[in-house]
Interface confidence: low
């Protein structure tokens, strides 16, 4: 597996995106919850599995960089202390991590407060605790519960000196009512140490969520450079105990320049 | 119950062509084709190609350029064409994908049956 590399060309288009969420192709609006749930539990495993096995699919969110920065408290630069950052899990619980201007350097981030109910947002982590993104809204969660009522298009073109997908792309409907437990699989997250035990937090789009940690045979992603996680936008869990991610031997030929990647014991 | 049916398997010359189709069917919500597996007697099963969590494509060396791995997400459906097939490409193939289904409402990790494919020389 590999994270996209930054000359790959990513375009990703939802239907929900509200106008004034325009800027940055990669920062449209939350595609949310339920679109994004993934496990890695395996399912009719088919006979003897010599190898690999299963593959999980798990999730990401685009790089940051909000366009809508500052949350909902007024802070001063006399009370206010920014704090750096690369990610969501390095802010509080009541903060999201964030370019401090709008279409500012998003190489330049800061721990932000977390937006209210009924504010504009990007992604989950950009909503205060019991609130989630919808529509590029902040909207209650429901005593922490969500109810997938989803309606979204992604259209997403790849070029990849590998080959591509061409014309992947994908309608999802979802308007059963399904509910996650907090920290259970599935459930909105800002760390790992939100989610039960053998998940972890990961993100999908702009979403972050509860993911079973990958087990044996898994296809995992190795990160080739520090920070390409955050071209990711499908993001997998990392390897569980005793297993790390190294490239799966290629049977026909002496070289390994495979990219393919799963978790092997070590 | 959900079930992903692999088919297009077959016995070819070198040089020959397949393509391979795997198809998911049942309660299905979404479908989300993670890659295709082989296993070749005596040997573990291998990826062969792979779905990137970027959502571009990988393969494995010895397919690259000659296989390719695409989607019909109407259809439920991920194949895989095969070119210029080689004897050592001989093997049982097995399709891999996450399924979100309405009878579970969760989402799974499916494995398709398998379909032989046989290159002679």
């Known amino acids: 597996m590999m994270a996209l590399g930054a000359a790959g060309a990513t375009r990703v288009f939802v239907a929900m995106v509200a106008a004034a969420l325009g800027g940055h192709p990669l920062l449209g609006v939350s595609a949310t919850l339920n679109s994004v749930l993934n496990s890695n539990a395996i399912k009719n495993l088919p006979p003897p599995l010599g190898g690999a096995a299963g593959h999980p699919g798990s999730a990401v969110s685009a790089a940051p960089g909000i366009l809508y920065p500052g949350g909902n408290k007024y802070q001063t630069i006399d009370n206010y202390q920014p704090y750096p950052c690369a990610e969501d899990e390095e802010c509080g619980t009541d903060e999201y991590c964030a370019s401090p201007t709008r279409g500012g350097d998003a190489g330049v981030q800061i721990c932000l407060a977390c937006r209210k109910r009924r504010k504009r947002c990007m992604r989950h982590a950009m909503c205060c605790p019991g609130n989630y993104c919808k529509n590029g809204i902040c909207v209650s969660s429901d005593q922490n519960h969500f109810r997938g009522e989803i309606e979204e298009t992604i259209t997403e073109s790849f070029g990849n000196d590998h080959s591509t997908l061409d014309g992947y792309s994908r309608r999802t409907t979802l308007s059963s009512k399904m509910y996650h437990t907090k920290g259970q699989e599935g459930s909105v997250c800002l760390r790992s140490s939100d989610c039960a035990s053998g998940l972890c937090c990961a993100r999908h789009f702009w979403s972050k969520i509860c993911k079973p940690v990958l087990k044996e045979g898994q296809v995992c992603t190795k990160h080739r450079r520090k920070g390409s996680h955050g071209l990711e936008i499908f993001q997998r869990c990392y390897c569980g105990e005793g297993l790390s991610c190294r490239i799966q031997k290629d049977h026909h030929q002496a070289s390994n320049s495979s990219r393919l990647h799963t978790c092997q014991r070590h | 119950e959900v079930q992903l049916v692999e088919s297009g398997g077959g016995l070819v010359q070198a040089g020959g062509s397949l393509r391979l189709s795997c198809a998911a069917s049942g309660s299905i919500v979404t479908f989300n084709p993670m890659g295709w597996y082989r296993q070749a007697p005596g040997n573990q099963r291998e990826l062969v190609a792979s779905?990137?969590?970027?959502?571009?494509?990988n393969y494995v060396d010895s397919v690259k350029g000659r296989f390719t791995i695409s989607v019909d997400s109407a259809k439920n459906t991920v194949y895989l064409q095969m070119n210029s097939l080689k004897p050592e490409d001989t093997a049982v193939y097995y399709c891999n994908a996450d399924i979100f289904s309405s009878s579970r409402l969760s989402w799974d990790n499916y494995w398709g049956q398998g379909t032989q494919v046989t290159v002679s020389s």
């Open positions: 779905i990137t969590s970027g959502g571009g494509a």
